[in-house]
Interface confidence: low
């Protein structure tokens, strides 16, 4: 039956381990409850509770049943798509490795211009290589209904997540309710702004309280936050209570009903609940499901503010009209005025095209690319001219009256607020991104991405710095591989070694500290893992009644 | 590379005021915090406060009252004013930088620090 | 104010020997703490932040333990240059606050 009908029997292993998933799930809350239902020796009348737990262990039996179940359907092992995948994938590493041994012994015989064309071919070929594994890689993420898992559990933890939230803003009682108040007012740019109030708003839910947004006379809209987003909470918007004070930590807190935020560089002393770590109880399904799990939580917070009022939705709906936004495309963020010479260094738009043509022909090996389409956000109102001269093949989408406002003397008014709204949609909307991470808008960009599709984790490419987010606790790898200098620049590594990333150069090097040693300098970006940060956030089960 | 140096009158009578100077190279008073210490001769240290990145001020709650710090960016100096000086405030004064590596991780680099005595 | 209390004023060791310096927070600091290591004369130089994680340059026979109360740094394959006096720091809330000095 397996080798009549592959298809039909790799959907049905992937339901089965679908299902096997969702019960191991249902099994870890039943025993979640079950324990805090358990009840004490002695005989005590507990009424309908004592009931109520044998029920919860009588279904706890059933489960554990049904998984030893699923768990013998299941050992037949993969599905024939994903080992005809896998077994490619090895291939292709072992003919990348032939084909470079090669041709990296014949570059050593050759000089002048015969060794240029030489190259030139070579690193044209090596890109073929590379996209031909990627592909397979793509496939491989998707076959045996990897793909279909993706989705579901991807949009399942987006809604618990998304429950939870609305749940800790929309407190039953107001008055009784604890508070955190967040003033928008931080003297920098809108993506600046926005990452502060997602920044109040992780050490709200991290301390159970709802967040209360502050933004009357709001530099970029005077009406404040509500006149462009819809309102934080619905029913509670009103910061009064019997006590206030200044965040002086959460024990310390805790008899505060309405604690004052300062901007996260003057926080102390600072709570766990902070980039880049994510809640313990989602980290294990995270991590499956999402290639950077911190940018997702951070995600979670950025949708749920920025949900627009309805006459910003039509704005959005009437832009991607006009400009002809379409599919394939993707998204250049060019950050040039007041950044340049202070944070970020100058990058002429050859840069960034690099990537965009290298992206377009992965692109091209799975799907028809009709056009190679590009939105082009800037704050630089003569790049598009430049762009469209010197790339005539590519279809250039950009509204330049949004670079004329994002410039520094217009800045801060309400019109600049719709275009740099319009440009983090848009870019966020796009296939790829390539940008400097330096840059708020492209990292906002970047994490509302990661709210449309179960893993966008790998859909970008930053000329500068990798993601980050500002006042972040530390950025930590685990070395997996044991690392000899070969250079003054390189510091040693041991596997399980701690190393405090700095930077990707994106070159094969990375920059950081070996915790270990207290040394910095480069190693090799392969030979080390993500460290992924678990804090013990509060779980709200009361929003899932 | 990352130096700080401070400049005291050396001398002060008691109850006067005392302004000392850190003048900072090697980094950036946006970036970084700045925090005060003493040392009286033979004993231990004093934290006084410190001026964040952003401007914001934080202060022992024991010498809030006759404690300012302040600075000024563009010229890389960063101030300390204490007033109604008495002679148990003679110390060493130091100045150090608030080290940020995710966490706050105290402080990484001081000044060689400038001696006061408080005496008529 | 949170009280770091070094319990040992002086301690005599031998070249090459290994020594521990102990600081007791008088309540949970987390892993807030820092080390200094100061000589006749000179500022304090920075040895240990986040309880066991070492500046950059500190040679890696400092080493610093512990969270919550105790904490200790231990100088292993001690030196003659080590011969100085040692502080620990919390800065879990304010005031920051340092040990006596041992």
């Known amino acids: 039956r397996d080798n009549d009908h592959p298809d039909h029997s790799s959907r049905e292993l992937s339901k089965i381990l679908a299902k096997l998933e969702r019960l191991k799930q249902q099994n870890e809350d039943l025993r979640r409850m079950a324990e805090s239902l358990r009840i004490p020796e002695g005989p005590i009348d507990q009424g309908p509770a004592i009931g109520r737990v044998r029920v919860l262990e009588e279904q706890l039996v059933k489960a554990k049943e049904q998984i030893e179940n699923y768990k013998k359907q299941t050992r037949n092992g993969l599905g024939k798509d994903h080992e005809i995948l896998r077994r490619r994938i090895e291939n292709g590493a072992k003919e990348l490795w032939f084909f470079l041994q090669s041709e990296l012994k014949k570059l050593k015989n050759l000089e002048g211009n015969e060794l240029q064309r030489h190259a030139d071919e070579f690193l044209l070929d090596l890109g073929h290589h590379e996209r031909s594994i990627m592909t397979d890689l793509y496939y491989l993420s998707q076959t045996d209904g990897a793909g279909d898992w993706r989705e579901k559990e991807a949009k399942d933890l987006t809604e618990l997540v998304q429950r939870r939230i609305t749940y800790l803003q929309n407190p039953k009682d107001c008055s009784k309710a604890k508070k955190l108040v967040c003033n928008i007012n931080k003297g920098c740019g809108y993506g600046c702004q926005l990452h502060h109030v997602v920044y109040c708003f992780m050490i709200a839910y991290g301390t159970q309280r709802t967040l209360i947004l502050e933004s009357q006379n709001w530099r970029y809209a005077t009406g404040g936050w509500e006149t462009v987003f819809r309102p934080v909470s619905e029913t509670c918007t009103d910061r009064s209570g019997i006590s206030t004070g200044h965040w002086s930590g959460e024990v310390k807190d805790k008899n505060v009903q309405v604690v004052e935020l300062p901007i996260v560089d003057s926080l102390h002393p600072r709570p766990p609940y902070l980039p880049l770590a994510v809640p313990e109880d989602l980290a294990d399904r995270l991590v499956r499901v999402h290639g950077d799990p911190a940018v997702w939580w951070v995600s979670q917070f950025v949708k749920y503010l920025i949900r627009p009022q309805p006459w910003l939705e039509k704005e959005i709906e009437e832009a991607t009209k006009k400009l002809g936004f379409k599919h394939p495309v993707i998204g250049v963020h060019v950050r040039r005025t007041d950044k340049v010479g202070t944070e970020a260094a100058f990058h002429p738009i050859e840069e960034y095209m690099v990537h965009v043509e290298e992206h377009f022909q992965l692109l091209a090996r799975r799907m028809q690319v009709d056009k190679k389409r590009v939105y082009l956000a800037t704050d630089d109102p003569s790049l598009l001219k430049e762009a469209k001269t010197k790339y005539p093949n590519y279809e250039f989408i950009s509204d330049n009256s949004i670079s004329w406002s994002a410039g520094l003397h217009n800045r801060y008014t309400e019109n600049s607020l719709r275009g740099v709204i319009l440009d983090i949609h848009f870019l966020s909307q796009a296939d790829f991104l390539v940008c400097t991470f330096s840059s708020q808008v492209c990292r906002v960009a970047y994490e509302i991405m990661q709210t449309l599709h179960p893993d966008a984790s790998a859909n970008f490419h930053s000329l500068d710095d990798i993601y980050y987010f500002g006042g972040q606790n530390a950025h930590n790898q685990i070395a997996i591989y044991a690392h000899q200098p070969r250079t003054a620049d390189e510091i040693p590594m041991e596997p399980g070694d701690i190393i405090g990333v700095a930077g990707n150069h994106w070159d094969g090097y990375s920059k950081g500290v070996n915790r270990k040693l207290g040394r910095t300098g480069l190693y090799p970006s392969y030979k080390v893992r993500e460290k992924i940060e678990t804090v013990k956030y509060p779980t709200y089960p009361e929003a899932e009644k | 590379q990352v130096q700080l140096k401070e400049s005291g009158p050396g001398l002060v009578a008691p109850s006067q005021s005392l302004s000392i100077t850190c003048t900072v190279s090697?980094?950036?008073?946006?970036?970084?915090?700045v925090n005060w210490v003493r040392q009286p001769p033979g004993k231990g240290l004093e934290w006084l406060g410190m001026i964040w990145g952003d401007g914001s001020t934080d202060y022992n709650s024991a010498l809030k009252s006759r404690l300012s710090i302040s600075k000024d960016n563009s010229k890389s100096q960063v101030f300390l004013k204490m007033n109604s000086l008495q002679t148990d405030d003679t110390a060493s004064y130091y100045c150090?930088?608030?080290?940020?590596?995710?966490?706050?991780?105290?402080?990484?680099?001081w000044g060689q620090g400038t001696s006061v005595t408080v005496s008529s | 104010d949170i009280v770091m209390t070094q319990s040992q004023k002086f301690m005599s060791t031998s070249l090459g020997d290994r020594v521990s310096v102990t600081c007791k927070a008088s309540q949970n600091v987390g892993s807030y703490v820092a080390w200094y290591q100061q000589k006749p004369g000179q500022s304090p130089k920075a040895l240990i932040y986040s309880a066991s994680y070492r500046y950059s340059g500190v040679p890696d026979r400092f080493a610093g333990s512990g969270s919550g109360t105790d904490f200790t740094l231990t100088i292993s394959n001690v030196q003659s240059e080590d011969l100085a006096e040692y502080f620990c720091?919390?800065?879990?809330?304010?005031?920051?606050?340092f040990g006596g000095g041992t």
């Open positions: 150090a930088r608030d080290f940020y590596d995710g966490y706050l991780y105290a402080m990484d680099y």
């Open positions: 090697g980094f950036s008073l946006t970036g970084y915090g």
């Open positions: 720091q919390q800065y879990y809330t304010y005031p920051y606050t």
